[in-house]
C-alpha cells in the first residue's frame, strides 16, 4: 500500500467538520518524486488539501471538510496516474445524530405467552447503527432501591419492542424498566417505568354468544337483543369490568358503547335498538378495580332484532 488515510473521527455529527490526512510512503519509487495528492468525497474532487514533505521523505496531505452533510460517504486520496486517477486509500465516513431519548415506553403482560411485552418510540432517525436494549431490575419497593438485575432484552433489528419471559418476572412485585439507546455518538435512556407486571395485564376477550331461548324465559322485546358470553377461562379469577359495543350492519353508523356491564354478568339484554335490524356486537374487558389494560375487542357476533315479540318460533342468526 502506497498511501494511508487517517481521519479525526470516522463518525461525526451530521454537519460537523472532519479532518483527514493522507500519507504516501517514500518507497513508492515508481511515483513522481513530488506527487500531487488529490482528495475525493464520493465522486466529487475536494479542493483545499495542504500538502507537505515530511522529514522521513513521505508526502502528507491534510484536508478539512468544513461540514460533512452526507450520512455516509467514502473519502479517498489519489494521484494522477497517466490519464486516470489512482486511488491510494479510502475510508468510509458516517455522519448522523446521537440517539434521542426513547419515549412512550409502555408494557403489557400477556398471560398466554407468560411474557411482559414492552414497546417504545425510538425517536428521530439517527442515520447510524443504533442499538436499543430493554433493561430492567426487580425491586421490593417503588423502584428507588434496585434488586436483582434482569437479563437485558435486545429486540430484533428494526423492532421497537421486546418480550421479557416469565422466568425473569416476578408477579405482584415491582420492576424498574427502561430503554437504553446507543450508537457511536452517544447513549440515551428513557424515563424509567416502575410497574408490577400484573398491573399491566391484558386479558383475552370473552366469546359472545346468543342466549339459548328457554321455554320459561320471555322472548326479547322488539328492539332488544339477548346476549351471553363465555369468559376467557384463564382470566376467570381476575375481577374485571366489561363493555359492549354495537352498530347496525348496514349503513355508516359508528359504534355505540354500552357499559360498564354489571359485575360478573354473563348475560345481558340490550334494548333501545332498531327493530328488525341486523347488528354487529363486540365485547371487551379490563382487570378492575385493580389496574390493567383493556382486552382487544372480541370477535363479532351478528344478531337481528325482532320485528315484535314472536308468538312461537324464536330465530337467532349466529356467526
Amino acid at each position: 500500500e502506497c498511501g494511508h488515510i487517517s481521519v479525526s473521527a470516522p463518525i461525526v455529527h451530521l454537519g460537523d467538520p472532519i479532518t483527514a490526512s493522507c500519507i504516501i510512503k517514500q518507497n513508492c519509487s515508481h511515483l513522481d518524486p513530488e506527487p500531487q495528492i488529490l482528495w475525493r468525497l464520493g465522486a466529487e474532487l475536494q479542493p483545499g488539501g495542504r500538502q507537505q514533505r515530511l522529514s522521513d521523505g513521505t508526502q502528507e496531505s491534510i484536508i478539512t471538510l468544513p461540514h460533512l452533510n452526507h450520512t455516509q460517504a467514502f473519502l479517498s486520496c489519489a494521484l494522477n496516474w497517466g490519464n486516470s486517477l489512482q486511488i491510494l486509500d479510502q475510508v468510509e465516513l458516517r455522519a448522523g445524530y446521537p440517539p434521542a431519548i426513547p419515549h412512550n415506553l409502555s408494557c403489557l403482560m400477556n398471560l398466554t405467552t407468560s411474557s411482559l411485552i414492552c414497546q417504545w418510540e425510538p425517536g428521530p432517525e439517527t442515520h447510524l447503527p443504533t442499538s436499543f436494549t430493554l433493561k430492567s431490575f426487580k425491586s421490593r419497593g417503588n423502584c428507588q432501591t434496585q434488586g436483582d438485575s434482569i437479563l437485558d432484552c435486545v429486540p430484533k433489528d428494526g423492532q421497537s419492542h421486546c418480550s421479557i419471559p416469565r422466568k425473569h418476572l416476578l408477579l405482584y412485585q415491582n420492576m424498574g424498566i427502561w430503554v437504553q439507546a446507543e450508537n457511536a455518538l452517544g447513549t440515551s435512556m428513557s424515563p424509567q417505568l416502575c410497574l408490577d407486571p400484573m398491573d399491566v395485564v391484558k386479558l383475552e376477550p370473552p366469546m359472545l354468544r346468543t342466549m339459548d331461548p328457554s321455554p320459561e324465559a320471555a322472548p326479547p322485546q322488539a328492539g332488544c337483543l339477548q346476549l351471553s358470553w363465555e369468559p376467557w377461562q384463564p382470566g376467570l379469577h381476575i375481577n374485571q369490568k366489561c363493555e359492549l359495543r354495537h352498530k347496525p350492519q348496514r349503513g355508516e353508523a359508528s359504534w355505540a358503547l354500552v357499559g360498564p356491564l354489571p359485575l360478573e354478568a354473563l348475560q345481558y339484554e340490550l334494548c333501545g335498538l332498531l327493530p328488525a335490524t341486523a347488528y354487529t356486537l363486540q365485547i371487551r374487558c379490563i382487570r378492575w378495580p385493580l389496574p390493567g389494560h383493556w382486552s382487544d375487542w372480541s370477535p363479532s357476533l351478528e344478531l337481528r332484532t325482532t320485528e315484535r315479540a314472536p308468538t312461537h318460533h324464536h330465530h337467532h342468526h349466529h356467526h
Epitope: 398471560l111 398466554t112 405467552t113 407468560s114 416469565r166 422466568k167 408477579l171 400484573m198 369468559p231 377461562q233 384463564p234 376467570l236 379469577h237 381476575i238 375481577n239 359485575l263 360478573e264 354478568a265 354473563l266 378495580p289
Partner: antibody
Framework: EVQLLESGGGLVQPGGSLRLSCAAS????????MGWVRQAPGKGLEWVSS????????PYADSVKGRFTISRDNSKNTLYLQMNSLRAEDTAVYYC???????????WGQGTLVTVSS | DIQMTQSPSSLSASVGDRVTITCRAS??????LNWYQQKPGKAPKLLIY???NLQNGVPSRFSGSGSGTDFTLTISSLQPEDFATYYC?????????FGGGTKVEIK
Amino acid sequence: EVQLLESGGGLVQPGGSLRLSCAASGFTFSLYWMGWVRQAPGKGLEWVSSISSSGGVTPYADSVKGRFTISRDNSKNTLYLQMNSLRAEDTAVYYCAKLGELGWFDPWGQGTLVTVSS
Amino acid sequence: DIQMTQSPSSLSASVGDRVTITCRASQGISSYLNWYQQKPGKAPKLLIYYASNLQNGVPSRFSGSGSGTDFTLTISSLQPEDFATYYCEQGWNYPLTFGGGTKVEIK
C-alpha cells in the same frame, strides 16, 4: 394476617346434609374468589367448588354437581358449602381457601372433617 | 378435563440432596401451574405460583420451571423440614385439577 377458619364438619349418615362455614379475616373478602378443596383419608387433593367475588359464578366438580351448593355472605366475610345427598365417598377433610388471580389457592384454612357413614 | 400427572409418586432422599419433581399436564396450560407442600395433619401451603414465582416467605432453595405441559419443582438442597408431600395444580381452566402428589421421605 389472612386467616380462614372452617367449621360445621362432623359425622352424617349417607343421604344426609351438612353445611360447612369458613370465616375469613385479614383481607377484603368481597374482592376475592374463594374455593373448597377436599382430601379423602390417605388420598390426594380434589377441588370441589369455587365462587366469584360477588357470588355470580359458581363452578363445581362433576362429582358434587347438583348435590353441593357454594355461597358467600360478603357482609359477614363468610363462605359456605351446603352438602346434600351425602355419600360415603364424600368423606374427607374439607379445606376452604382464597383463590389467587391466576388460579392458585392461598392461604388455606385448617380443614374440617366430614365423615359420611351409617 | 385437564389431567395432571406427577412423578415420581414417592422418593427417598437425604438432607442436602437436590430433589426434582415433575408434573405433566394433558394439554397446554401456559404457566398456570402451582406447587404446594403438605405435611401430615396440616393444610397444604402454597410454594410456587404461575410456574416459577416463589410465594412470600418460601425459602429460595425451592424453584419452579416449565411452561406448556411440562413443569418441574426443584429443591436445591433438601432440609429436614422439607420432608412432606408435594402437589401440583393447574389454574388454567375449570375443573381445577391437582396432581396425585409426590411424597418426599428420608432415606
